[in-house]
Interface confidence: medium
């Protein structure tokens, strides 16, 4: 004969676990039903009655099968360093992404917990490694024959233009100036830009100061895996 299907609540066999979408209630000592995503436990189970579930209220959610007494509050509105990419529903939290020019400074499995502005490389320094979703820009000094005259989180060092006759030699922060109006060879005009990262986050936070320029405050300051790169600057 096939085994009888137990209906919740039921006492599990010694050494066995409750089935999928059930949990063991230590007070009742019974296997009881979990509540579905979008719901929460309004009344916990007893030895004779199963869990009573209720829908999450506005601005609250549960994403998983659960037996929590209250739904989780959706995150605060996305702050000035974010854009909303997913609205709050009964089954999912609001999701915000770090806006262009920012990266996720502290991430967890649920998404980003803290956005921070991308480091800007000052004149004489260019971007050695662009920012990503979870890492800051790395700056490097412009090598001989190259320059950067901008304060930017995207500009790389560019070669000096080649002059027939040099009026002012170039340096790390300035292009060469030619005496003739038409140099022998020059790079395309305008700075070279690198793409900005976009990172997912589900947490409202305030902008955090850059490690290299932040004044002393009562809050924690972000410390990256390595010290701030030389040549970085604030806004």
């Amino acid at each position: 004969l096939p085994a009888q299907v137990a209906f919740t609540p039921y006492a599990p066999e010694p050494g066995s676990t409750c089935r999928l979408r059930e949990y063991y209630d230590q007070t009742a000592q019974m296997c009881c039903s979990k509540c579905s995503p979008g719901q929460h436990a309004k009344v916990f189970c007893t030895k004779t009655s199963d869990t009573v579930c209720d829908s999450c209220e506005d601005s609250t959610y549960t994403q998983l099968w659960n037996w929590v007494p209250e739904c989780l509050s959706c995150g605060s509105r996305c702050s000035s360093d974010q854009v909303e990419t997913q609205a709050c529903t009964r089954e999912q939290n609001r999701i915000c992404t770090c806006r262009p020019g920012w990266y996720c400074a502290l991430s967890k499995q649920e998404g980003c917990r803290l956005c921070a502005p991308l480091r800007k490389c000052r004149p004489g320094f260019g971007v050695a490694r662009p920012g990503t979703e979870t890492s800051d820009v790395v700056c490097k000094p412009c090598a001989p024959g190259t320059f950067s005259n901008t304060t930017s989180s995207t500009d790389i060092c560019r070669p000096h233009q080649i002059c027939n006759v040099v009026a002012i030699p170039g340096n790390a922060s300035m292009d060469a100036v030619c005496t003739s109006t038409s140099p022998t060879r020059s790079m395309a005009p305008g700075a070279v830009h690198l793409p900005q990262p976009v990172s997912t986050r589900s947490q409202h936070t305030q902008p955090t100061p850059e490690p290299s320029t932040a004044p002393s405050t009562s809050f924690l300051l972000p410390m990256g895996p390595s010290p701030p790169a030389e040549g970085s600057t604030g806004d």
């Epitope: 959610y61 994403q63 007494p69 209250e70 989780l72 509050s73 959706c74 995150g75 605060s76 939290n93 996720c104 400074a105 502290l106 991430s107 967890k108 499995q109 649920e110 998404g111 917990r113 803290l114 979703e133 979870t134 890492s135 589900s202 947490q203 409202h204 936070t205 305030q206 902008p207 955090t208 100061p209 405050t217 809050f219 924690l220 300051l221 972000p222 990256g224 895996p225």
Partner: antibody, heavy 117, light 110 residues
């Protein structure tokens, strides 16, 4: 899933010490990890956190005194210049986000550091 | 930094009684508060997160609540196994990531 600390020992003041937290059953690229310490007979004191992206944050008092780093399966806590006040059991714990909320849901047994001359 | 003030530091309650532990945050932490239980020689164990949500496998005799910046853990029908030290922990996310623990409450079961 488990977390285990190692490296705790008796050191003299000023001698740098590195504690190692070895994790198994989950990926450090998905989870943040925190370090917490507890002096004998005292309460819990948060030291800092390393996020799944590798970024670190420290308690104000711990900044400059501790450095947190990681490999693919371990998280290290370096005590740069221990003093006798750093004598404590050091715990490594997984720092999870429940939506907008945070908690330390998986702890190691701790490793004892004794600083004495 | 945010400071968590936990009271009382010690409480004694007979089996079957009710224990109430309070934590007050010095700043608005928006329910980002967890509760832990620690027994001698053991690491802390997560009991509750988001002020009122039970962690997996934790008895529903425990209840968390919030009133403004005051947070309360209530243990009803106290059992001998509840004898331990309880800590609250908040996470404050502003211009950085700050975690603070309360001083702890020792629960003695008579």
């Amino acid at each position: 899933q488990s977390v285990e600390e190692s490296g705790g020992r008796l050191v003299t003041p000023g001698t740098p010490l590195t504690l190692t937290c070895t994790v198994s059953g989950f990926s450090l690229s998905s989870y943040a990890m925190g370090w917490v310490r507890q002096a004998p007979g005292k309460g819990l004191e948060w030291i800092g956190i390393i996020g799944s992206g590798g970024n670190t944050y420290y308690a104000t008092w711990a900044k400059g005194r501790f450095t947190i780093s990681r490999t693919s399966t371990t998280v290290d806590l370096r005590i740069t210049s221990p003093t006798t006040e750093d004598t404590a059991t050091y715990f490594c714990a997984r720092d999870v986000g429940y939506g907008d909320y945070d908690a330390l849901d998986l702890w190691g047994q701790g490793t004892l550091v004794t600083v004495s001359s | 930094d945010v400071v968590m003030t936990q009271t009382p530091s010690s409480v004694s309650e007979p089996v079957g009684g009710t224990v109430t532990i309070k934590c007050q945050a010095s700043e608005e932490i928006s329910s980002n508060l967890a509760w832990y239980q620690q027994k001698p020689g053991q690491p802390p164990k997560l009991l509750m997160y988001a002020a009122s949500n039970l962690a997996s496998g934790v008895s529903s005799r425990l209840k968390g609540s919030r009133s403004g910046t005051d947070y309360t853990l209530t243990i009803s029908g106290v059992q001998c196994d509840d004898a331990a030290t309880y800590f609250c922990q908040c996470t404050y996310i502003g211009s950085g990531y700050v975690v603070a623990f309360g001083g702890g409450t020792e629960v003695v079961v008579k």
